[in-house]
Amino acid sequence: MAVTACQGLGFVVSLIGIAGIIAATCMDQWSTQDLYNNPVTAVFNYQGLWRSCVRESSGFTECRGYFTLLGLPAMLQAVRALMIVGIVLGAIGLLVSIFALKCIRIGSMEDSAKANMTLTSGIMFIVSGLCAIAGVSVFANMLVTNFWMSTANMYTGMGGMVQTVQTRYTFGAALFVGWVAGGLTLIGGVMMCIACRGLAPEETNYKAVSYHASGHSVAYKPGGFKASTGFGSNTKNKKIYDGGARTEDEVQSYPSKHDYV
């Protein structure tokens, strides 16, 4: 039961995280004009990964896309790349994890296959989350650097008379959305990896060896004493009271502990 819960929760958390990463990537408020000592401004600037916007106090908002590719800073391109890689990996991870969910039956997919898919999606979520966190952090670092540079040149004198006030930018809402979303995706990935351990079959796939007792036939299957994963009850040695010896392949239809989770 705990395995399914962990897997399901991991999926949901990752789903929310990836939705957040997509939202952050599309948002315009990656950097917003720093209002420092001027909380009310007639012209408010904010920028995203794809366009920059200006909101006037009149209520009119104008956004302009970055129509150049080569003219953009390398750091911005890197952030875009990281966020897109994060989204793509996350989307593939979600697709894989849907088929890996224990609560969804697809043909006669074995638990080992589901475990592998769960692990794969978990790793994808972890990398996706890390990409998002890295992207947002690179952008935040760029902002901090530019903020202090523009603070140093806050007023650049022109002929000693005219002042040019430089627009300083600070963290926008998208950064916080990105950090939280990346963290959630990462947590969801870790949960999927943990769930994978509980999904993996606990017996080594050896052929059962038959021991013919004098009273009645009992097939003993060795390798049953494996360390408990902590999910569900520990599997004891399975005894198959069947009157005759059988191989592992012949006893597949017998219930395993995973059917009762």
């Epitope: 004009q33 001027n38 009310v40 401004t41 007639a42 012209v43 600037n45 904010y46 920028q47 920059s52 916007c53 200006v54 006037e56 106090s57 009149s58 209520g59 009119f60 104008e62 302009r64 005219v162 002042q163 040019t164 006030v165 627009t167």
Partner: antibody, heavy 118, light 113 residues
Framework: QVQLQQPGTELVKPGASVKLSCKAS????????MHWVKQRPGHGLEWIGM????????NYNEKFRSKATLTVDKSSSTAYMQLSSLTSEDSAVYYC???????????WGQGTSVTVSS | DIVMTQSPSSLTVTAGERVTMSCKSS????????????LTWYHQKPGQPPKLLIY???TRESGVPDRFTGSGSGTDFTLTIRSVQAEDLAVYYC?????????FGSGTKLEIK
């Protein structure tokens, strides 16, 4: 069409207060900031402040913060400016105005002439 | 506060002449976010409220004749009337729309001979 209607004149005594009105019509009143501007002969135009009829947010020119109080009545699409502790310096024409693209004042009321005299 | 300085304070011209008037601001009115200058021109005829002519330094308000042209960037701006008409008799004001408090120039009075 857009109209901002203001009463023509107000005659008040020194030390008293006056509440000027500006009735808006021809547009969605709650969508635009309403600004107030003072004009005194020989002193040009001075921006007093602004109010948003929907959020009631205000922003004042520090010079007029203790002099003017801006309010609105959404139901009647009317903006008000109360001027307190009036002196001869407050004798002027007061305009209400709406802002649009570029924060430009695209429509102006006809102005209310305030005369402070004993 | 941004100080707006207009020159000349008055101009006397004959109808049909080309007129230019200047407006300087103490701080740049250029916004890098949208590459626009937040400077507005108004004119005020005797006994009337000011009327919007040009915003964003050079964008004409609808209904304003094309003889009115705004130019300039940063701190130096110019209003040009290509061929002055008798009805252009007015006081011309420039205004900072970039930061609060909004401030106006002292005006240029245009008189027709």
């Amino acid at each position: 069409q857009v109209q901002l209607q203001q009463p023509g004149t107000e005659l008040v005594k020194p030390g008293a207060s006056v509440k000027l009105s500006c009735k808006a019509s021809g547009y969605t009143f709650t969508n635009y900031w309403m600004h107030w501007v003072k004009q005194r002969p020989g002193h040009g135009l001075e921006w007093i402040g602004m109010i948003h009829p929907n959020s009631y947010s205000t922003n004042y020119n520090e010079k007029f913060r203790s002099k003017a109080t801006l309010t609105v009545d959404k139901s009647s699409s009317t903006a008000y400016m109360q001027l307190s502790s009036l002196t001869s310096e407050d004798s002027a024409v007061y305009y209400c105005t709406r802002i649009y693209y570029g924060n430009a004042m695209d429509y102006w009321g006809q102005g209310t002439s305030v005369t402070v005299s004993s | 506060d941004i100080v707006m300085t207009q020159s000349p304070s008055s101009l006397t011209v004959t109808a049909g002449e080309r007129v230019t008037m200047s407006c300087k601001s103490s701080q740049s009115l250029f916004n890098s976010g949208n590459q626009k200058n937040y400077l507005t021109w108004y004119h005020q005829k005797p006994g009337q409220p000011p009327k919007l002519l040009i915003y964003w330094a050079f964008t004409r308000e609808s209904g304003v004749p094309d003889r009115f042209t705004g130019s300039g960037s940063g701190t130096d701006f110019t209003l040009t009337i290509r061929s002055v008409q008798a009805e252009d008799l007015a006081v011309y004001y420039c205004q900072n729309d970039y930061s609060y408090p909004f401030t106006f120039g002292s005006g240029t009075k245009l008189e027709i001979k």
